[in-house]
Amino acid sequence: EEAQGDKIIDGAPCARGSHPWQVALLSGNQLHCGGVLVNERWVLTAAHCKMNEYTVHLGSDTLGDRRAQRIKASKSFRHPGYSTQTHVNDLMLVKLNSQARLSSMVKKVRLPSRCEPPGTTCTVSGWGTTTSPDVTFPSDLMCVDVKLISPQDCTKVYKDLLENSMLCAGIPDSKKNACNGDSGGPLVCRGTLQGLVSWGTFPCGQPNDPGVYTQVCKFTKWINDTMKKHR
């Protein structure tokens, strides 16, 4: 199999500090998933990233950076409609054990007030493997630009795997995509969080196989209600 691209899949290192809401969920010292900072106490990620305990890396584009904040988290709340069979409603809130310190490198993500339309250019980011099927994990945060794809076009590829709270993004005839390790990380469009990396075909980066994301604009009420309820 060909090693695909050389970043995220076919991306590049993010402009330093351009994704201050991006976090990494670590299991011990190892990358488990991506995530986004919603506020000082809460991280949003994918439900399939659930663990008993998390170490959350914030404030640096480099995973091994000693200046980064590392905060433990032991409480997480999957969306009640998450299905381990269909993976619909693949999102989860993780409550930090202590508050994150906001700075130029640690900022809250903007939750969407509307769902962006197909054709919108967005950026997906993460520390997931930059090659597939063989893995190469970068230490620096990677970014790639993709476009939102209509449910009708995406259903042609994924058929009944696609559920109505799933969002597709990619570039026709391109390898640009997320991969394992990017799960739960952000798809940001016009400055707002529109998606969380959920799944895609493996090996990653197969042209015309879009990445599939949880469509965040459909869950803003649940996100706000859950944070309020578990203050």
Epitope: Q30, H32, S132, D134, S198
Partner: antibody
Framework: QVQLVQSGAEVKKPGSSVKVSCKAS????????ISWVRQAPGQGLEWMGA????????NYAQKFQGRVTITADESTSTAYMELSSLRSEDTAVYYC????????????????????WGQGTMVTVSS | DIQMTQSPSSVSASVGDRVTITCRAS??????LAWYQQKPGKAPKLLIY???SLQSGVPSRFSGSGSGTDFTLTISSLQPEDFATYYC?????????FGGGTKVEIK
């Protein structure tokens, strides 16, 4: 041609543990799922669990939860299945099998076809 | 968890016969089903994956069909080497689950 070579037969006492290994020769399994399936004498096949080394997670059948641990050593292309608190009903042939995932992320367990199998390891539990 | 019910548990047939084995899932699994053949003392062998896709090297007399909850394995013309036990397995999501098996015996 990739082959899965399993460790040899084991005789164990009730209450003890057994660890069976499964080594990929002639290739890697880091990009694959490795499943463990057992078959008691004269009985059908029973799926115990699986690991996808590069995705870093193991999944277990409810029946074995808490008693089975599946791990993988990517540097030696070897998977392991450890079963603890053995009882006589655990007497069986234990197989490992390899299959390619179709998806990463949430759907990573879906549709894996296990096309290459080990030769099986007979585990006898007897006092 | 999804349960798999396979029938019949055994079938007696002659060389040249058409043999049909069915498998029913307790809930819809789309087309995520595989069929395996096992001979005594040997490891299982993959025949069909994704309900109807023939594994490379498997003779074309084997075919699979179905989706959702009901699936069928058909051997169009039974050969001497086909006398074995056949298992279906749901591959919709972990935990995978095997059917109880169907033993194809010589009549």
């Amino acid at each position: 041609q990739v082959q899965l070579v399993q460790s040899g037969a084991e005789v164990k006492k009730p209450g003890s543990s057994v660890k069976v290994s499964c080594k990929a020769s002639g290739g890697t399994f880091n990009n694959y799922a490795i499943s463990w399936v057992r078959q008691a004498p004269g009985q059908g096949l029973e799926w115990m669990g699986a690991i996808i080394p590069i995705f870093g997670v193991a999944n277990y059948a409810q029946k074995f939860q808490g008693r089975v641990t599946i791990t993988a050593d990517e540097s030696t292309s070897t998977a392991y299945m450890e079963l603890s608190s053995l009882r006589s009903e655990d007497t069986a042939v234990y197989y490992c099998a390899r299959g390619a995932p179709n998806y990463y992320g949430a759907q990573s367990s879906r549709g894996i076809a296990f096309d290459i199998w080990g030769q099986g390891t007979m585990v006898t539990v007897s006092s | 968890d999804i349960q798999m019910t396979q029938s019949p548990s055994s079938v007696s047939a002659s060389v040249g016969d058409r043999v049909t084995i069915t498998c029913r899932a307790s809930q819809g699994i789309s087309s995520w089903l595989a069929w395996y053949q096992q001979k005594p003392g040997k490891a299982p062998k993959l025949l069909i994956y994704a309900a109807s896709s023939l594994q490379s090297g498997v003779p074309s007399r084997f075919s699979g069909s179905g989706s959702g909850t009901d699936f069928t394995l058909t051997i169009s013309s039974l050969q001497p080497e086909d006398f074995a036990t056949y298992y279906c397995v749901q591959a919709n999501a972990f935990p995978y689950k095997f059917g109880g098996g169907t033993k194809v015996e010589i009549k």
